[in-house]
């Protein structure tokens, strides 16, 4: 699997992670910090 | 699956000003980014703007910066666009089509025809 | 403001032929470019991402290369539903398309 780090266009749209680019899949994805979860890092659980 | 449907095609004087819908299905827009793209007759595609539906932030092309507003409902999951001050030269199909998760533009509406006429 | 100038404008071939399309950026995209297929009435098919990836299904006539700023798009065989107008997207800073290079068969 091809991964890469995001264009700069996507600068924020994971909130609490680091976005990566999933090449061969064609999709951003979001790994998120610890203590945060959701599609896009939005979410804080204890 | 990924379904985005547009509002219906509109006739608009000069001047006016129109709104066009676009209502995701299968995924939900605060996940995603959701664009705009225009293409008028004989001419090329345009990108317009986008919105970020989980802040409500927008980026807009230059050209259309002041004309345009990009909203989104997301407790309807829907992303509108409007366009003001028309003339003959916004005549056009506007398509929605869903970033963020997809880096580039894989999923789109079906496109609206806009036209502007006297 | 990222301007992406594509070349031809359009160009007629045969079926067979092979058939060669560049986009160049007015700055580095860093092999942030799309290639897209529109037909009248449909919207925009992607077929290549990151200058080169093929996108799933799309056939593997359709071929992308380059970096930087020069970029190329090329169709290995060209096949009577290739006929389309066809346009590159930068999405490195916002979204850029090219103007479009409309093929048609000779």
């Known amino acids: 699997v091809s991964i890469t780090k995001c264009s700069s266009d996507m600068n924020g749209y994971c909130l609490h992670g680091q976005c990566i680019y999933l090449v061969d899949m064609s999709q951003n994805y979001c790994r998120c910090e610890v203590g945060y979860t959701g599609v896009r890092c939005e979410h804080f659980f204890l | 699956q990924v379904q985005l449907q547009q509002s219906g095609a509109e006739v608009k004087k000069p001047g006016a000003s129109v709104k066009v819908s676009c209502k995701a299905s299968g995924f939900n827009i605060k996940d995603t980014y959701m664009h705009w793209v225009r293409q008028a007759p004989e001419q090329g595609l345009e990108w317009m703007g986008r919105?970020?539906?989980?802040?409500?932030?927008?980026k807009y092309d230059p050209k259309f910066q002041g004309r345009v507003t990009i909203t989104a409902d997301t407790s309807t999951n829907t992303a509108y666009l409007e366009l003001s001050s028309l003339t003959s030269e916004d005549t056009a199909v506007y398509y929605c089509?869903?970033?963020?998760?997809?880096?580039?533009?894989?999923?789109w509406g079906q496109g609206t025809l806009v036209t502007v006429s006297a | 403001d990222i301007q992406m100038t594509q070349s031809p404008s359009s160009l007629s071939a045969s079926v067979g032929d092979r058939v060669t399309i560049t986009c160049k950026a007015s700055q580095d995209i860093n092999k942030y470019l799309a290639w897209y297929q529109h037909k009248p009435g449909q919207a925009p098919r992607l077929l290549i991402h990151?200058?080169?990836t093929l996108h799933p299904g799309i056939p593997s006539r359709f071929s992308g290369s380059g970096s930087g700023t020069d970029f190329t798009f090329s169709i290995s065989s060209l096949q009577p539903e290739d006929i389309a107008t066809y346009y590159c997207?930068?999405?490195?800073?916002?979204?850029?398309f090219g103007g479009g290079t409309k093929v048609e068969i000779k």
């Open positions: 919105i970020d539906p989980l802040n409500d932030k927008t």
């Open positions: 997207l930068q999405y490195d800073n916002l979204r850029t």
């Open positions: 089509a869903r970033g963020g998760g997809d880096p580039v533009f894989v999923y």
């Open positions: 990151y200058t080169s």
